[in-house]
């Protein structure tokens, strides 16, 4: 009984929702990450940005989940062409933006 890939994307979205809803203190101590272009290759680009945040347990599951949506190995310090040049934002805002975009993809049935 194969299930559409939407269930996996839904898991990722639910994790991002958990992060935004459970946020009390500044997420990851207000760490800043590179903003990314959300129009293409969003999973790898998001991972390349978030992987540079260390010691933040709140986003560890998200970092790990994103690996399952990115075909190649991503290491800290690796920067994609999808990065918005010289623009950094707080992790909290990054997560919110990513959540909005993934919800849009989910609604449109774009799972790849």
């Amino acid at each position: 009984s194969p299930v559409p890939p939407s269930t996996a994307l839904k898991e990722l979205i639910e994790e991002l929702v958990n992060i935004t809803q459970n946020q009390k203190a500044p997420l990851c101590n207000g760490s800043m990450v590179w903003s990314i272009n959300l129009t293409a290759g969003v999973y790898c680009a998001a991972l390349e940005s978030l992987i540079n945040v260390s010691g933040c347990s709140a986003i560890e599951k998200t970092q790990r989940m994103l690996n399952g949506f990115c075909p190649h190995k991503v290491s800290a310090g690796q920067f994609s062409s999808l990065r918005v040049r010289d623009t950094k934002i707080e992790v909290a805002q990054f997560v919110k933006d990513l959540l909005v975009h993934l919800k849009k993809l989910f609604r449109e049935g774009q799972f790849n």
């Epitope: 194969p2 890939p5 690996n67 399952g68 949506f69 990115c70 075909p71 190995k73």
Partner: antibody, heavy 123, light 106 residues
Framework: EVQLLESGGGLVQPGGSLRLSCAAS????????MSWVRQAPGKGLEWVSA????????YYADSVKGRFTISRDNSKNTLYLQMNSLRAEDTAVYYC????????????????WGQGTTVTVSS | SYELTQPPSVSVSPGQTASITCSGD??????ACWFQQKPGQSPVLVIY???KRPSGIPERFSGSNSGDTATLTISGTQAMDEADYYC?????????FGTGTKVTVL
């Protein structure tokens, strides 16, 4: 709590068949890839097969290709391994493993393992 | 087929550092995982993504991966760390486990 419970192991003659089952609970079973890993007595770990949670892709070790078939029933939260043409070298403890999320599940890490079920192939 | 080679055994005194290597062609280009297995028990993931620790795994376990070698390091080794350790990676649509290393705490 994530739990995996294997069943179906036992003693079977060479050339025989056996079907292993793995009942999963505590997570969204349909979202995750699942694997079977085995361990022969006194030997190391050997991956057997995987079933993606993203699509219907299946993967097999060369040693079992054409003899073993992995399947899943997402409505029952159960993973299966149909083993045909069994050989003495298939004797092992078979573990059911929760694998990763997404199309590249192998980039995730095998988090949760069942307790295993023992398969003995002998005449 | 892809192979991951580990030393059969490593001995360490309590409180000392144990290092286990895992060698494979261009292993650094892949994610390496490490599993701990004690006698009669199921394997436990101790390191994923080369160097990440799952929740519940003590800080004394660390990992690295570059070139052709991944390394699991146990700092301040304790008696309870005595076990078999296996590395693992994915190559050409198959998972590959290392040959396994028995860690003995003297």
């Amino acid at each position: 709590e994530v739990q995996l419970l294997e069943s179906g192991g036992g003693l079977v003659q060479p050339g025989g068949s056996l079907r292993l089952s793995c009942a999963a609970s505590g997570f969204t079973f349909s979202s995750y890839a699942m694997s079977w890993v085995r361990q022969a007595p006194g030997k190391g770990l050997e991956w057997v097969s995987a079933f993606s949670g993203w699509d219907v892709s299946t993967y097999y070790a060369d040693s079992v290709k054409g003899r073993f078939t992995i399947s899943r029933d997402n409505s029952k939260n159960t993973l299966y391994l149909q083993m045909n043409s069994l050989r003495a070298e298939d004797t092992a403890v078979y573990y059911c493993v929760q694998d990763g999320l997404g199309p590249y599940f192998y980039n995730y890490g095998m988090d949760v393992w069942g307790q295993g079920t023992t398969v003995t192939v002998s005449s | 087929s892809y192979e991951l080679t580990q030393p059969p055994s490593v001995s360490v005194s309590p409180g000392q550092t144990a290092s286990i290597t895992c060698s494979g062609d261009k292993l650094g280009d892949k994610y390496a995982c490490w599993f701990q297995q004690k006698p009669g028990q199921s394997p436990v993931l101790v390191i994923y993504h080369d160097s990440k620790r799952p929740s519940g795994i003590p800080e004394r376990f660390s990992g690295s991966n570059s070139g052709d070698t991944a390394t699991l390091t146990i700092s301040g080794t304790q008696a309870m760390d005595e076990a078999d350790y296996y590395c693992q990676a994915w190559d050409s649509s198959t998972y590959v486990f290392g040959t396994g290393t028995k860690v003995t705490v003297l």
